[in-house]
Amino acid sequence: MRRGPRSLRGRDAPAPTPCVPAECFDLLVRHCVACGLLRTPRPKPAGASSPAPRTALQPQESVGAGAGEAALPLPGLL
């Protein structure tokens, strides 16, 4: 059985190493990748009831409560 690279998951997962510029933290495999490798979904319409953008963790973001909630259109925006 081939497995993906996720050996440490959930509450045992280590905090990610900050990504270098032009890289974004892929939440599903828990490592930094080129932002261009991550899919760009359609934008949410203005006035939608849930304003949080669908992002990966940006290079500048810390990991903790609210991680992944970047409001700026940074390069890692998915």
Epitope: R2, G4, P5, R6, R9, A13, L27, R39, T40, A67
Partner: antibody, heavy 117, light 111 residues
């Protein structure tokens, strides 16, 4: 907008093989995560596995290595090779792509695979 | 594997009713301050449709009568005022740990 179209389903005998295709348009399969999900008649959803931007695959261990996900980036098409098929593999097979957290926001229409003698 | 248990398995309700479906994970699906929990709607013969992602975020184009809440192991999908087109089966899904798993589904039927 992403569009996904599955094909290749049909009737196959137990022990046989089948390859399903999922043609994607609206985005490149070299970006993000591309999944197969199945649903047996009258039953719930079961995640089969994915292939991601790097070509990394991960499978539901319950499938015991009988299924293989691959891709042809020149055709922007995802494949599911199914071997040693059993009656319990009878299901509608969907391809779907995900948001950053694994939520599947685009789905194909599904293709029915029937394993029966 | 993380087991997802939905309740109830089915329910009967009327148009205008407030409907609540719960999903309990066998272990926490939170990581990095995010709940890796999602909700889908499926109608007979159709592919599932994403309603809520990341426990509480409404997918684009989904009516605001749908909402999600919860964290850790306990999650809720609420339909504030059931409409005729909402009669369907609803599934929760976790993507915190491999393999990704779905709940068994909750069928919402007309009373």
């Amino acid at each position: 907008e992403v569009q996904l179209v599955e094909s290749g389903g049909g009737l196959v005998q137990p022990g046989g093989s089948l390859r399903l295709s999922c043609a994607a348009s609206g985005d490149s399969i070299t970006r993000g995560y591309w999944n197969w999900v199945r649903q047996a008649p009258g039953k719930g959803l079961e995640w089969v596995g994915y292939i991601n931007y790097s070509g990394t695959t991960y499978y539901n261990p319950s499938l015991k290595s009988r299924f293989t996900i691959s891709r042809d980036t020149s055709k922007n098409t995802l494949y599911l090779q199914m071997n040693s098929l059993r009656a319990e593999d009878t299901a509608v097979y969907y391809c779907a792509t995900t948001l950053p957290y694994g939520a599947m926001d685009y789905w194909g229409q599904g293709t029915l695979v029937t394993v029966s003698s | 594997d993380i087991q997802m248990t939905q309740s109830p398995s089915s329910l009967s309700a009327s148009v205008g009713d407030r409907v609540t479906i719960t999903c309990r994970a066998s272990e926490s699906v939170d990581d990095y301050g995010i709940s890796f929990m999602h909700w889908y709607q499926q109608k007979p013969g159709k592919a599932p449709k994403l309603l809520i992602y990341r426990a509480s975020d409404l997918e684009s184009g989904v009516p605001s009568r749908f909402s999600g809440s919860g964290s850790g192991t306990d999650f809720t999908l609420t339909i504030s005022s059931l409409q005729p087109e909402d009669f369907a089966t609803y599934y929760c899904q976790q993507t915190s740990k491999d393999p990704w798993t779905f709940g068994q589904g909750t069928k919402v039927e007309i009373k």
